[in-house]
């Protein structure tokens, strides 16, 4: 079979098939017969991740402080900065362009998994035999006391909000 | 300017191998198969097989299928032909040469517009 | 593979001659032919491409014909540094495969 297109790091112009510039460079010049490609680096703070023939670099992502982000990872010229929020904040999307605060679990849930830089808090109902009495970001279900192991018996039954209530089983005489 | 420097001559036993290394400068080295041939004394050029600098992927002559081992180093912008097992037949000059597509008249060509001065390898007990 | 047959396998000329190479291909490979020039001691170059495109460069004298199986190359009027060994070589698929070579003497 014959050749049907240039090859993968290649771009076709004025009939020849010339090299794309590397990550982390941008295109000066296209080749011709007699000349390569032309590629120069990013700058600072520019980068290009792929094969391009890109004319300009793109800007390394700001961290915003004012909207509670930090750099989680420079950037090179060959990889964009990644951004992450500050303790108690998530990123409202996957490109982490702001924050916001972890939300807490309402009394009645619990914690299923911790907030992280990226990721809100997850929430899950306390099952039964499980409360929680508090609006926390951290607290887990707590399991309701068992009151047979101290000898005492229920008094009132515990709900996904509240724990049992214990007290002295009834003596007969 | 564009250029590839081959390595220098070779003496070799049978039996033996031989690793040729082929240096690119003046183009982006990943960006371009490099071809290696041969051609034995008085006589015409055999294609041995190409890899492609990027990857690494190769391709090589049916021929020459489990003797021969292309690589390269991008970071040197470097490609290596290994022979192994050779024979007296083997002796030939071995060129490393630029693949360079082209379109022209609504189809593409591929030609070797740079190639490397050659290396001669010597087989001989 | 493809097979590529060259004639004449050597030839003759003076300068100022006119010279014809010819080169039959075993299948059809349209017009993917490239004519290259080695001289004594050195790596092949390209000469045309594909079948009968010069190369800026190439002086006009060279010129290449054909399709399909059967093609040419033409030196019109044969000059010192134009002594050497002329190949051509298929494109078309892989491997590809060179004609034998045509050397061309001084007469």
């Known amino acids: 079979e014959p050749p049907t297109a240039c090859r993968e790091k290649q771009y076709l112009i004025n009939s020849q098939c010339c090299s794309l510039c590397q990550p982390g460079q941008k295109l000066v010049s296209d080749c011709t017969e007699f000349t390569e490609t032309e590629c120069l680096p990013c700058g600072e703070s520019e980068f290009l991740d792929t094969w391009n023939r890109e004319t300009r670099c793109h800007q390394h992502k700001y961290c915003d402080p004012n909207l509670g982000l930090r750099v989680q990872q420079k950037g090179t010229s060959e990889t964009d900065t990644i951004c992450t929020c500050e303790e108690g904040l998530h990123c409202t999307s996957e490109s982490c362009e702001s924050c916001v605060p972890h939300r807490s679990c309402l009394p009645g849930f619990g914690v299923k998994q911790i907030a992280t830089g990226v990721s809100d808090t997850i929430c899950e109902p306390c099952p039964v035999g499980f409360f929680s009495n508090v609006s926390s970001a951290f607290e887990k279900c707590r399991p309701w006391t068992s009151c047979e192991t101290k000898d005492l018996v229920v008094q009132q039954a515990g709900t996904n909000k509240t724990d049992v209530v214990c007290g002295p089983q009834d003596r007969q005489r | 300017q564009v250029q590839l420097v081959q390595s220098g001559a070779e003496v070799k036993k049978p039996g033996a191998s031989v690793k040729v290394s082929c240096k690119a400068s003046g183009y982006t080295f990943p960006g371009y198969y490099m071809y290696w041939l041969r051609q034995a004394p008085g006589q015409g050029l055999e294609w041995m097989g190409w890899i492609n600098p990027d990857s690494g992927d190769t391709n090589y002559a049916q021929k020459f299928q489990g003797r021969v081992t292309m690589t390269r180093d991008t970071s040197i912008s470097t490609a290596f032909m290994e022979l192994s097992r050779l024979r007296s037949d083997d002796t030939a000059v071995y060129y490393c040469?630029?693949?360079?597509?082209?379109?022209?008249?609504?189809?593409?060509?591929?030609?070797?517009?740079?190639w490397g001065q050659g290396t001669t390898v010597t087989v001989s007990s | 593979d493809i097979q590529m047959t060259q004639s004449p396998s050597s030839l003759s000329a003076s300068v100022g001659d006119r010279v014809t190479i010819t080169c039959r291909a075993g299948?059809?490979?349209?017009?993917?032919l490239n004519w290259y020039q080695q001289n004594p001691g050195k790596a092949p170059k390209v000469l045309i491409h594909p079948a009968s495109s010069l190369p800026s460069g190439v002086p006009s004298r060279f010129s290449g014909s054909g399709s399909g199986t059967d093609f040419s190359l033409t030196i019109s009027s044969l000059q010192p540094e134009d002594f050497g060994t002329y190949f051509c070589?298929?494109?078309?698929?892989?491997?590809?495969?060179f004609g034998g070579g045509t050397k061309v003497e001084l007469k």
């Open positions: 070589q298929q494109s078309y698929s892989t491997p590809p495969t």
């Open positions: 299948q059809n490979i349209s017009r993917h």
């Open positions: 040469a630029r693949e360079k597509p082209r379109y022209f008249d609504s189809f593409y060509y591929y030609l070797m517009d740079v």
